[in-house]
C-alpha cells in the first residue's frame, strides 16, 4: 500500500482543515488508514483522524482544529496499521479556504434595485470575519453567455445592482464566495443558488 | 455549554493530604490539555500545573513539584490534583481551566474551590 | 522563569473612557501573551489570546497589541461591568507565569 498523491490540507480557520490524498488503488480509507496530527508546541499530544473515501483511491479526513493562530505548525503522520505511509507537516494560516458564505437572498421589491444579501460563515470573534471579501455571481437560466461576476471589496455581505442592468422577464440565478487577502487565501466555495425572476418597468420612451 | 465543577476542597492541617476533583462537561474532555490555577487570599493567578490532552505529560511549578500530582480520567471527564505534605502558603482557592488548542492558555474555568492549611 | 510586569497596578477611570494597560516580559514570548478579566468573588475569564485574539463571546471594544516583550490591553470604551482587575499571562514557556494584575475602579 503506497500513496500515489500526498496529503494537502487547507484550513477553515475557525474549527476545521481537510486533508485529501490518492492511493495507489483501492482503498477502504475508514478501515485501513489513520492520520495523526499534533500541533508542534508545549504539551501537546497527537490527535487521530479516521478519513472516508473520497473516489475509489481517494481519501479525505476533517481534523479538528479550534482557535487557530497565525504559528500553528502541526505535524502530519499517515498510517497503515504499524506502517507509517507518510510525514510531513502544516500551517494552517498559510493553506486557509474560507467557510462559504450563506443565507443568500435576493430582495426585488427596493424600486427597481436588486438587493442580494449575504450571512458572514464566521462569527464576529474570528479572525476572518472581518477580512472577507465576496464575489457575486449571477447568471441567466436562459442565456449561458448572460454570466457575470461582481466584485464586493467592502466588508458588508451585500450589494445592489440596478435591476435594469440584466434582462426583465427572465429568471436568474445568484451565488456568492468569499476569499481574505489578508491571509492570501484561496476562493471558499460557493454558496448555494439562490433564482429569482427578474421584472421591472422598462422606462417610458418618448418618440 | 463548556462547564467545569471544582470539588475537594477544606480544612488541613500542615503535612496533610487533599484530592481535588474536577468534573467537565459541554465539550470533548480528551481533547484539550487541562490545568490548576490557584489564587492566595487577596493575591494574584498561580499557575500550579498543567496535563496533556491524553494524560501524557504532565508540568508543576516548582513551588509545588514533588508535593502535588496532576492526573484525569478521559472516560469519567475528569480532572484531580492531588496534594500532599501541604503547607499554609498552599492556602488558596484552586480554580481547574481548559485549554484552547495550546496547552497554555485558559479558555475556560471553574468556580474554584477553597483549600486552607492552618492548624 | 519568565518574570511578567503589569502595570499600573491599579488605575481610576469613567464609563466611556480608553483605558490602556501594559504588560511587560522578561524575555520575548513570541506573542503567546493572554489576557484575563477576574470580578471579586469570581473566578477569571479569558479575554484575549495570542496578543490580540478575542475569545469567544467578548465584546469588541477589547483589544490586544504587541509583540516581542511588550504588550496592551485596550478597552476602547469602559462600560459599567468593565470595572475589575485584568491579567496578563505569558504562554510561550514553562513555567507559566501570570502579572500581579491592574484593579481599573471607578473614579
Known amino acids: 500500500m503506497k500513496v500515489l498523491q500526498e496529503p494537502t490540507c487547507v484550513s477553515d480557520y475557525m474549527s476545521i482543515s481537510t486533508c485529501e490524498w490518492k492511493m495507489n488503488g483501492p482503498t477502504n480509507c475508514s478501515t485501513e488508514l489513520r492520520l495523526l496530527y499534533q500541533l508542534v508546541f508545549l504539551l501537546s499530544e497527537a490527535h487521530t483522524c479516521i478519513p472516508e473515501n473520497n473516489g475509489g483511491a481517494g481519501c479525505v479526513c476533517h481534523l479538528l482544529m479550534d482557535d487557530v493562530v497565525s504559528a500553528d505548525n502541526y505535524t502530519l503522520d499517515l498510517w497503515a496499521g504499524q506502517q507509517l505511509l507518510w510525514k510531513g507537516s502544516f500551517k494552517p494560516s498559510e493553506h486557509v479556504k474560507p467557510r462559504a458564505p450563506g443565507n443568500l437572498t435576493v430582495h426585488t421589491n427596493v424600486s427597481d434595485t436588486l438587493l442580494l444579501t449575504w450571512s458572514n460563515p464566521y462569527p464576529p470573534d474570528n479572525y476572518l470575519y472581518n477580512h472577507l471579501t465576496y464575489a457575486v455571481n449571477i447568471w441567466s437560466e436562459n442565456d449561458p453567455a448572460d454570466f457575470r461576476i461582481y466584485n464586493v471589496t467592502y466588508l458588508e455581505p451585500s450589494l445592489r445592482i440596478a435591476a435594469s442592468t440584466l434582462k426583465s422577464g427572465i429568471s436568474y440565478r445568484a451565488r456568492v464566495r468569499a476569499w481574505a487577502q489578508c491571509y492570501n487565501t484561496t476562493w471558499s466555495e460557493w454558496s448555494p443558488s439562490t433564482k429569482w425572476h427578474n421584472s421591472y418597468r422598462e422606462p417610458f420612451e418618448q418618440h | 455549554e463548556v462547564q467545569l465543577l471544582e470539588s475537594g476542597g477544606g480544612l488541613v492541617q500542615p503535612g496533610g493530604s487533599l484530592r481535588l476533583s474536577c468534573a467537565a462537561s459541554g465539550f470533548t474532555f480528551s481533547r484539550y490539555a487541562m490545568s490548576w490555577v490557584r489564587q492566595a487570599p487577596g493575591k494574584g493567578l498561580e499557575w500550579v500545573s498543567t496535563?496533556?490532552?491524553?494524560?501524557?505529560?504532565?508540568n508543576y511549578a516548582d513551588s509545588v513539584k514533588g508535593r502535588f500530582t496532576i492526573s484525569r480520567d478521559n472516560v469519567k471527564n475528569t480532572l484531580y490534583l492531588q496534594m500532599n505534605s501541604l503547607r499554609a502558603e498552599d492556602t488558596a482557592v484552586y480554580y481547574c481551566?481548559?485549554?484552547?488548542?495550546?496547552?497554555?492558555?485558559?479558555?475556560?474555568w471553574g468556580q474554584g474551590t477553597l483549600v486552607t492549611v492552618s492548624s | 522563569d519568565i518574570q511578567m510586569t503589569q502595570s499600573p497596578s491599579s488605575l481610576s477611570a469613567s464609563v466611556g473612557d480608553r483605558v490602556t494597560i501594559t504588560c511587560q516580559a522578561s524575555?520575548?514570548?513570541?506573542?503567546?501573551l493572554n489576557w484575563y478579566q477576574q470580578k471579586p468573588g469570581k473566578a477569571p475569564k479569558l479575554l484575549i489570546y495570542?496578543?490580540?485574539r478575542l475569545h469567544s463571546g467578548v465584546p469588541s471594544r477589547f483589544s490586544g497589541s504587541g509583540s516581542g516583550t511588550d504588550y496592551t490591553l485596550t478597552i476602547s470604551s469602559l462600560q459599567p461591568e468593565d470595572f475589575a482587575t485584568y491579567f496578563c499571562?505569558?504562554?510561550?514557556?514553562?513555567?507559566?507565569?501570570f502579572g500581579g494584575g491592574t484593579k481599573v475602579e471607578i473614579k
Open positions: 495570542y496578543t490580540s
Open positions: 496535563i496533556s490532552s491524553g494524560g501524557s505529560y504532565t
Open positions: 481551566a481548559r485549554a484552547t488548542a495550546r496547552a497554555t492558555e485558559f479558555a475556560y
Open positions: 499571562q505569558q504562554g510561550n514557556t514553562l513555567p507559566l507565569t
Open positions: 524575555q520575548d514570548i513570541s506573542n503567546y
